[in-house]
């Protein structure tokens, strides 16, 4: 049987980006099940190291189980993780029944912001927004929200927040106790 081309064999290869906060550089982990041969870049344990944020890198992938042409993988390196901060934007006067969470860009970067998507999951609710506002919540309840940021559909950072809503007003408290 003839061998596939490496371009075909690795057509659907996916990548995870891992950030080093000390060096401020990324590692791209190639999600493959076998040892692969990398060109134009050196790979260690199927990882390409020392990638600069917002700078494209190209790596050609081959193996002797496949023929030319090699798979050319363009690594779209995301912005640095510390450029983003998950901020609690809940208004104090509404903190008993609402939660507001917002991703803030706290430093500039050169990546195309159009390629950045934000995702929140609070309980079984999913939101694809940079900011979420949950309303009509129970006072004095804990709510957990998980969030992630994706660059060109690759997750590169995530955060979780557990927020406890404030005590309700005395009137609300009376009503809730009567309901019990």
């Amino acid at each position: 049987p003839s061998k596939p081309t490496c371009d075909e064999k690795y057509a659907n290869i996916t990548v995870d980006y891992l950030y080093n906060k000390e060096t401020k550089l990324f590692t791209a982990k190639l999600n493959v099940n076998e040892n692969v041969e990398c060109g134009n870049n050196t790979c260690t344990n199927n990882e390409v190291h020392n990638l600069t944020e917002c700078k494209n890198a190209s790596v050609s992938i081959s193996h002797n189980s496949c023929t030319a042409p090699d798979k050319t993988l363009i690594l779209d390196v995301p912005p640095g993780v510390e450029k983003f901060q998950l901020h609690d934007c809940t208004q104090v006067e509404k903190a008993d029944t609402t939660i507001c969470l917002k991703w803030k860009n706290i430093e500039t970067f050169t990546c195309d912001t159009q390629n950045i998507t934000y995702r929140f999951q609070c309980g079984n609710m999913i939101f694809d927004n940079k900011e979420i506002k949950l309303e009509n919540l129970e006072p004095e309840h804990e709510y957990k929200c998980d969030s992630e940021i994706l660059y060109n559909n690759h997750k590169f950072t995530n955060a979780s927040k557990i927020i406890k809503t404030d005590f309700g007003s005395p009137e609300q408290k009376l009503i809730s106790e009567e309901d019990l």
């Epitope: 076998e34 041969e37 990398c38 050196t42 790979c43 199927n46 193996h63 002797n64 189980s65």
Partner: nanobody, 123 residues
Framework: QVQLQESGGGLVQPGGSLRLSCAAS????????MGWFRQAPGKEREFVSS????????YYAGAVRGRFTISRDNAKNTVYLQMNSLQPEDTAVYYC????????????????WGQGTLVTVSS
Amino acid sequence: QVQLQESGGGLVQPGGSLRLSCAASGGTFSDYGMGWFRQAPGKEREFVSSISWSGNSVYYAGAVRGRFTISRDNAKNTVYLQMNSLQPEDTAVYYCAASSTWNNNDPTEYEYWGQGTLVTVSS
């Protein structure tokens, strides 16, 4: 038929360094992924490091990553293992091996093996 011959083993103190070499003959060296394995007394043979045909891709076992460096010189038909910060637990017979398929780092993936060179780390 590929023949492999390791050299460079010996006795070294903890924290010391050694460089192992593996010379290949009898085949086209650049057709093979190369690996280093080790076997300590009473233990199974374990993967240490491997390197692709061109040398652009390398793999390390967790226990040696950051301390050992694999390299190859296709013009000299030789693969090297530079071992730094050696510890008593690195004591073993080190084997060089060649694989034409080089799909993973399992010893069964490698068709050709050297005789081994003994590395002893002791004060």
